[in-house]
Amino acid sequence: LRLLDHRALVCSQPGLNCTVKNSTCLDDSWIHPRNLTPSSPKDLQIQLHFAHTQQGDLFPVAHIEWTLQTDASILYLEGAELSVLQLNTNERLCVRFEFLSKLRHHHRRWRFTFSHFVVDPDQEYEVTVHHLPKPIPDGDPNHQSKNFLVPDCEHARMKVTTPCMSSGSLWDPNITVETLEAHQLRVSFTLWNESTHYQILLTSFPHMENHSCFEHMHHIPAPRPEEFHQRSNVTLTLRNLKGCCRHQVQIQPFFSSCLNDCLRHSATVSCPEMPDTPEPIPDYMPLW
């Protein structure tokens, strides 16, 4: 988790002088509770936006937006703590809006936004906005939270972001898998425009089970420049096991931008259709 660029982050708006500060996620009002505290945020919205860095890279960011309730507690509102928690790692990043002037009621509802938390593809986050100072122990909570899941790199809009492109999202191998005679599979895929090696991982399964019955790894050396974007054809020999008929072929590239952590593509060959009715048993058995 990180913030997009570290250029001046602003939270000021007409009628309010405000500054954005780094936060330890442990506001002072936890340790030194105040008697009078503001009410909770209203209408918290989390959206996925895309933002360019000063270097021109494109990143997915969490766009956080909320409004204030129209009650007298805004007189005691000193700021807000914005927290983003990545759920699978428990990593948390916070910033603090520090109000440098007192809020006053005006003809429009107060609205705040922040769009600088960079989020990762295929990750889930909990976003919390806490109004400050935080409530006294046993006081009514004055925060609002929402969870949201960021699409993975196969999503059309995510595919062109810098983190996705770095992991090989623009490569479409268009894998085809064909079953041949004599227990063989022909795998065909399109090479990318980089002189890097690939690995084909074959895993076979029985018809209705998820325990593998055969595994094989095939190494493909780095193509020459004249082979870029060409089809690579590989024939894999299967183990002759009856019922080991469902095959998953996974292609792992080793691009320089992602090394051994690049996006993998896969294709599956299903078992051949079984006839619905068993073969009829003849009325008589021949003796020869």
């Epitope: 989390i46 889930e124 909990e126 969870n147 949201f148 899941l149 699409p151 196969e154 999503h155």
Partner: nanobody, 127 residues
Framework: QVQLVESGGGLVQPGRSLRLSCAAS????????MHWVRQAPGKGLEWVSG????????GYADSVKGRFTISRDNAKNSLYLQMNSLRAEDTALYYC????????????????????WGQGTMVTVSS
């Protein structure tokens, strides 16, 4: 123009099944998470189920878990809700809704993050 059109509602006996459909048009359906929300007579909106853009993630309200199944067909720009073991308390107007953002709202109050709603299809569960 951008629209969602629900169908498949009707009168059904308790314990029976019904399948709702939602046809989407006017936006890139395969980029957005979609949801089902219902409103029982005289009650407020209740989120029922949601599904991410590629069906990789699905969520259900506790009241329908194990009975309802959400699915989508991006090639047909369609969202579905298979409702089994229906109960009288499932009687409601069912809306399909598009998430405003490209992400998938997976917790907290989600309904306020939907920007396009259908006109709803009525499901009545009664013997």
């Amino acid at each position: 123009q951008v629209q969602l059109v629900e169908s498949g509602g009707g009168l059904v006996q308790p314990g029976r099944s019904l399948r709702l459909s939602c046809a989407a048009s006017g936006f890139s359906f395969d980029e957005y998470a979609m949801h089902w929300v219902r409103q029982a007579p005289g009650k407020g909106l209740e989120w029922v189920s949601g599904i991410s853009w590629n069906s990789g993630r699905k969520g259900y309200a506790d009241s329908v878990k194990g009975r309802f199944t959400i699915s989508r067909d991006n090639a047909k720009n369609s969202l579905y809700l298979q409702m089994n073991s229906l109960r009288a308390e499932d009687t409601a107007l069912y809306y399909c809704a598009k998430e405003k953002s490209l992400g998938y709202c997976s917790g907290g109050s989600c309904s306020d993050g939907f920007d396009i709603w259908g006109q709803g299809t009525m499901v009545t569960v009664s013997s």
